[in-house]
Amino acid sequence: MMTGTIETTGNISAEKGGSIILQCHLSSTTAQVTQVNWEQQDQLLAICNADLGWHISPSFKDRVAPGPGLGLTLQSLTVNDTGEYFCIYHTYPDGTYTGRIFLEVLESSVAEHGARFQIP
């Protein structure tokens, strides 16, 4: 039975040219996290594997940085980065948990950054 829940940063906005941290946190389960995938719509951005560490997809290497923790930092944002992002936690024995974040990249300087949190 899957008892865990994923907390995310929810809906967030950021300024064009800036950077943003996408953060998810899996709680209420003792399942072992074997891998976390970060995806944008159908594109794989990055993987953090428990044994192999981080792997950034080649097409995003210049604009994506690993961390903090199991989160992902997006840099040099463009309006095309607006959209849904998913953190997919592969766990044993529970299975897969998915969290959703919606990012809006704004042209103006009045972008309000959503609440962020760090994984302890």
Epitope: D51, L52, G53
Partner: antibody, heavy 117, light 107 residues
Amino acid sequence: EVQLLESGGGLVQPGGSLRLSCAASGFAFSSYAMGWVRQAPGKGLEWVSAITSSGGGTYYADSVKGRFTISRDNSKNTLYLQMNSLRAEDTAVYYCASIRERRFDFWGQGTLVTVSS
Amino acid sequence: DIQMTQSPSSLSASVGDRVTITCRASQRISTYLNWYQQKPGKAPKLLIYGTSSLQSGVPSRFSGSGSGTDFTLTISSLQPEDFATYYCQQSYIIPWTFGGGTKVEIK
């Protein structure tokens, strides 16, 4: 006792192919990620490739991407490295190693691959 | 890719000496830093993982420290069997990369 035994090395001409094997024993092979590391004569260590425990994820150094393929057969406790379009700069001792929590914890004795005409 | 720079590339020391080898990463790698020992004609052997954890069976005279970009391997009292080449390796992000090695020779 953990044992990793590489085989399949040898002399091959530039442009040729080789398949290296690594037979594992003494540990739960199917639960471990595995990798290949090479060492050119008189040089340092270079990571070549890695594969997740299930075989579903494979990763390569840029220097071998598109030419080398890592795979595994968990039913045979064996890791493979298919090497195509070999170049002189691929000449090295190739080590297979088990990977646990981001470290190479056990290594084979290595097999020498020589690419020369 | 993350570049790993080891220093010195070689050193001469005597039995009983305290030896320090440093490794610098071109970007922060948290504590995902491993150290290996290699003797001529042999496979590398894991000494230290995660910056400071001693691999099972490795003598306690070996220790590791550091975080971020700067790391150190220390041999508190060099023994005859410690003359070898030592490599650092980052495992924060693929591709995993090694330092160029430090050869510890007998003075």
